[in-house]
Interface confidence: low
């Protein structure tokens, strides 16, 4: 009766910096009593640890037990279904989970007005989940980069692209008076790792925040 | 992982006509910017007609009413019908996409798109 079920289809990870989600698509027909066994294994340690028994969701948060990723090289997950005493055959990640697999964010995006100029500040993120000397500036130490995305509102598709090197910027606006609207995505410069848009954020800018000068 | 394959490029004379095409693969996302971007050697890539997820297209001033970006879903391909080809049309076109929540407006200023295809060669002779 070992493996009289199906397999879970494709498992996988999708992690952005201290948030390692473990996913999985359902066996089909699928009953009401399915569950999911998960397991792990840390590369370099080669043995399969229990993670959790009977997950009735299609994914599991590994955040707690992933911690030290940043440190290590990796890891490799397992899921299997479970319904009673009959059981699946395991299905594992294709690729290792590694730092390279992590999605880059930013915390937020903190804009304001001086002289004409948007001065922008990118705030880091600071997960709870994160030990203390795990920071995001320690962990990507170099060759941060940001890419930055303006839209005038209105007007959809007028765009300005920038890449900055650092967390604060300035914009000039040329003069230009209206709503500005920016986002943001984060890079490495010496990584492959993906980056995520940020939620954009809108400041006014009026002609009370321009100054003449001779 | 998500890959782009570029096909349809060639050698055509001034007014003549082609269709680039686009496989796109590895990705289950619902929303997108998709476009098409183009280089000459030694100049920037530049941004020639973009699609969203919501149908919305956008064109580079220099290719309006001559070229027409459009994408099949159920094929999960992106195509750029290129028609009244000029020699300055000459060019390595790039499909590209970005991909998933959060991501800007599409337009064709827009080059900060996550993947990119390895290009296909367009040559147009007067």
């Known amino acids: 009766h070992g493996t009289e079920l199906p397999s879970p289809p494709s498992v996988w990870f999708e992690a952005e910096f201290f948030h390692h989600i473990l996913h999985w698509t359902p066996i089909p027909n699928q009953s009401e009593s399915t569950c999911y066994e998960v397991a792990l294994l840390r590369y370099g340690i080669e043995s399969w640890n229990s993670i959790s028994n009977c997950s009735q969701t299609l994914s599991y948060d590994l955040t707690a037990v992933t911690l030290d990723l940043y440190h290590s090289n990796g890891y490799r997950a397992r899921v299997r279904a479970v319904d009673g005493s009959r059981h699946s055959n395991w299905t594992v990640t294709n690729t290792r989970f590694s730092v390279d697999e992590v999605t880059l964010t930013v915390g937020s995006v903190n804009l304001e007005i001086h002289n004409g100029f948007i001065l922008g500040k990118i705030q880091l993120p600071r997960p709870k989940m994160a030990p203390a000397n795990d920071t995001y500036e320690s962990i990507f130490s170099h060759f941060r980069e940001y890419e930055i995305a303006i839209r005038k509102v209105p007007g959809n598709f007028t765009f300005t692209h920038k890449k900055v090197k650092h967390e604060n910027f300035s914009l000039l606006t040329s003069g230009e008076v209206g709503e500005f609207c920016v986002q943001v995505k984060p890079s490495v410069a010496s990584r492959s790792n993906k980056g995520m848009w940020s939620k954009e954020e809108c400041i006014s800018l009026t002609r009370q925040y321009f100054t003449v000068t001779n | 992982q998500v890959q782009l394959q570029e096909s349809g490029g060639g050698s055509v004379q001034a007014g003549g006509s082609l269709r680039l095409s686009c496989g796109a693969s590895?990705?289950?996302?619902?929303?997108?910017?998709m476009g098409w971007f183009r280089q000459v050697p030694g100049k920037e890539r530049e941004g020639v007609a973009v699609?969203?997820?919501?149908?919305?297209?956008s064109y580079a001033d220099s290719v309006k009413g001559r070229f027409t970006i459009s994408k099949d879903n159920g094929k999960n391909t992106l195509y750029l019908q290129m028609n009244s080809l000029k020699p300055e049309d000459t060019a390595m076109y790039y499909c590209?996409?970005?991909?998933?929540?959060?991501?800007?407006?599409?337009?064709?200023?827009?080059?900060?798109?996550?993947?990119w295809g390895k290009g296909t060669q367009v040559t147009v002779s007067s």
């Open positions: 590895g990705y289950t996302y619902s929303s997108y910017c």
């Open positions: 590209a996409a970005d991909l998933g929540h959060y991501r800007p407006p599409c337009g064709v200023l827009y080059l900060g798109m996550d993947y």
């Open positions: 699609i969203d997820s919501d149908g919305s297209t």
